[in-house]
Amino acid sequence: KESCDVQLYIKRQSEHSILAGDPFELECPVKYCANRPHVTWCKLNGTTCVKLEDRQTSWKEEKNISFFILHFEPVLPNDNGSYRCSANFQSNLIESHSTTLYVTDVKSASERPSKDEMASRPWLLY
């Protein structure tokens, strides 16, 4: 029997390598049964997760799952770090695993990864 609890499908220890200056969408896949929960994003600062208030977010609905998306337009160097999404469901707070963004600053060509490094790095298939 499928659980009717809200479930947030971010993998533990997941990582994304992205380029500063590019647009990027960070997805929080959300499974729920009836009413869509209120979902927020926060960014980890040590052990506390600071809520991201004035950031562009959107929902994308698919057949069996919904995605709460945090938009980076564009990615900035200080977007580097770990993020977590949280859902309020029946007065319970459900937290996802954190996912880490590694931002490469394209201004410094010497910091750009080589082709070999790129092959072994988590470049997104977006």
């Epitope: 993998k11 052990t47 937290e95």
Partner: antibody, heavy 119, light 112 residues
């Protein structure tokens, strides 16, 4: 039925390369991390590294970095371990395993494939 | 790297008796999400390993309830409450809190 089947093992000469495959079925590979482990004859288990088939991210044990490449084809539900510059001490049974990435709900192992490095 | 040390290296226990295997890590396995990613594997002779226990104490589906796991921080225990003949195996603890993931050296469980 869940299955992980490793293939590609066998006898290989020192200095050569080998690509092992791990064919999976019965679950969505993109919901998991694919790990490769190895076990030398009569010895314990060693983690080689892991791949996230959803985005290609890989992690390795330091001793395998630069010599091993783990990849996955999510559309075919197959993962790979490419090992270069093989040495006699790489002789081992190599296992792939698939661990659910969100809630640890399962951890499946393949039956293993024996790689023998010898001249 | 985190060093995982199991004790004893081998253990002989009579059928129906309790078997206890210990695992100690060189640093805490408590992750920042508040969970502890310590697993126990069973490897029977000539077979591939099988996950028995994850998150210290959660039994994998189909694992008999005579198996249990406990512990926190750096000290963990696998207990078999009443040893059965089919429990003859090597048992490994492994941690996937910190990269690189590491294993204990294994404990060989034999029937006395």
């Amino acid at each position: 039925e869940v299955q992980l089947v490793e293939s590609g093992g066998g006898l290989v000469q020192p200095g050569r390369s080998l690509r092992l495959s791990c064919t999976t079925s019965g679950f969505n590979i993109k919901d998991t991390y694919i790990h490769w482990f190895r076990q030398a004859p009569g010895k314990g288990l060693e983690w080689v590294g892991r791949n996230d088939p959803a985005n290609g991210n890989t992690k390795y044990t330091a001793s395998f970095k630069g010599r091993a490449t783990i990849s996955a084809d999510g559309s075919k539900s197959i993962a790979y371990l490419q090992m270069n510059s093989l040495k006699t001490e790489d002789t081992a049974v190599y296992y792939c395993a698939s661990y659910e990435g969100y809630y640890e709900r399962f951890g499946y192992w393949g039956q293993g494939t024996l790689v023998t490095v010898s001249s | 790297d985190i060093v995982m040390t199991q004790s004893p290296d081998s253990l002989a226990v009579s059928l129906g008796e309790r078997a206890t295997i210990n695992c100690k890590s060189s640093q805490s396995l408590l992750d920042r999400d508040g969970k502890t990613y310590l697993n126990w594997l069973q490897q029977k002779p000539g077979q591939s390993p099988k996950r028995l226990i994850y998150l210290v104490s959660k039994l994998d589906s189909g694992v008999p309830d005579r198996f249990s796991g406990s512990g926190s921080g750096t000290d963990f225990t696998l207990t078999i409450s009443s040893l059965q003949a089919e429990d003859l195996a090597v048992y490994y603890c492994w941690q996937d809190t910190h990269f690189p993931y590491t294993f204990g050296q294994g404990t060989k469980l034999e029937i006395k």
